[in-house]
């Protein structure tokens, strides 16, 4: 398998967080140090991910802090693994008409989901909201990802690589940050704009119409803000 350790690849973009979203809440997919995968209502150091795109719409998803790949077993359970298995740790990425993204195992066909149900992906299906994801640029200060052991002497380059195995804390030549539309700043609760008084789009309704089509800013973040 070419490039059997995608962690070493140079085509990783910036840190992002994958989150499910309804009109009322959002859960960020996080990969814990012990390999457990769940959702958190907010960005955490364990929900900071790197997503590497491969040929034919395949992606490899890695938790930066856990140093684990997102993988799936034959029952559809998702987990984080230090070992990269091409069959279990690559996912087919597809963008739905509503602008949300789904990820499914080409091997087992199950959807990546923060819900407990294991459902196979079928073309044209409308998956439940906890199986549909949006991406958001990391907002956690990078210092939180970098907790070196205190040393008396100046650290060497080798020490740096141990602390930052994915090389995400230093600028790199081939960074491909998320589109600006995905990381736009939104009004705060103190703003007097209509969006701020209805920050979750409650007045305008719920999930984006699955037949509305279109991507761009609306496809990237269909709702004004999630709590």
């Amino acid at each position: 398998y070419p490039n059997a350790s995608p962690l070493l690849g140079s085509s990783w973009g910036g840190l992002i967080h994958l989150y499910t979203a309804t009109a009322r809440n959002s859960y960020h997919l996080q990969i814990h140090k012990n390999g457990h995968v769940d959702g958190a209502p907010h960005q955490t150091i364990y929900s900071a991910l790197m997503i590497r795109s491969e040929d034919a719409g395949f992606v490899v998803i890695t938790g930066v802090m856990s140093r684990r790949y997102l993988c799936m077993d034959f029952r559809g359970n998702i987990f984080g693994s230090h070992y990269f298995d091409p069959e279990n740790c690559r996912f087919q990425h597809q963008t739905l008409e509503n602008g949300y993204d789904v990820y499914h195992s080409p091997q087992y066909h199950f959807l990546v989901s923060l819900g407990r149900a294991k459902r196979a992906f079928l073309p044209g299906m409308n998956p439940p909201p906890y199986s549909q994801f949006l991406s958001r640029r990391n907002e956690i200060p990078l210092i939180h990802f970098n907790t070196p052991i205190p040393r008396r002497h100046t650290q060497s380059a080798e020490d740096d690589s141990e602390r930052d195995p994915l090389n995400v804390l230093k600028p790199r030549a081939r960074m491909t940050p998320a589109p600006a539309s995905c990381s736009q700043e939104l009004p705060s609760a103190e703003d007097n704009s209509p969006m701020a008084s209805d920050p979750l789009g409650v007045v305008r309704g719920g999930r984006v119409n699955t037949h509305a089509g279109g991507t761009g800013p609306e496809g990237c973040r269909p709702f004004a803000k999630f709590i």
Epitope: A23, N25, D38, P41, G115, P128, T210
Partner: antibody, heavy 117, light 106 residues
Framework: QVQLVQSGAEVKKPGASVKVSCKAS????????MHWVRQAPGQGLEWMGI????????SNAQKFQGRVTMTRDTSTSTVYMELSSLRSEDTAVYYC??????????WGQGTMVTVSS | AIQLTQSPSSLSASVGDRVTITCRAS??????LVWYQQKPGKAPKLLIY???YLESGVPSRFSGSGSGTDFTLTISSLQPEDFATYYC????????FGPGTKVDIK
Amino acid sequence: QVQLVQSGAEVKKPGASVKVSCKASGYTFTNHYMHWVRQAPGQGLEWMGIINPISGSTSNAQKFQGRVTMTRDTSTSTVYMELSSLRSEDTAVYYCARDIVDAFDFWGQGTMVTVSS
Amino acid sequence: AIQLTQSPSSLSASVGDRVTITCRASQGISSALVWYQQKPGKAPKLLIYDASYLESGVPSRFSGSGSGTDFTLTISSLQPEDFATYYCQQFNDYFTFGPGTKVDIK
């Protein structure tokens, strides 16, 4: 084990406010949204609102906009729901419930609020 | 917002009966539907999530089915402890509940 323990029954006069508490234990408080649901006597369940336990951000059902305030205290793993300008039709049992992405898996025991002059 | 309707609103049945309750959504909600059981004076109890998945600890006589707009809760053989009110709830956009179905003794 997960537990949501709510404050005791309240009797209030019309126009007053009531504040109900819900203390969580047995799990990481900041990892789950909390909801408030109420049930008038002999009636069905009515969703009131949701609070993000780490940011304190809230979203309420339109029916309660401006009357309900949800807060949380992370140091005690407690969420609060305050309902103001009470009227007789607010007489109900008020529940807190934990969100686990695809369901409300644990509920408080309920707090009976009676609004009567 | 999505509305949920349940039918019937109440039903009388005997122990051992097969009971079916339906929940209809005003628009498609995929499989994002939950069923709860509530007994008088008690908080609701989760039975089924994601339309058809049995919550841990719930007896296998309970089952759920459906997707999109039409959903069903079935109790294959009604037991004395099953007399209660059953609610559906959708998780697709807000968190709307159905009006409930009361199952009582015939």
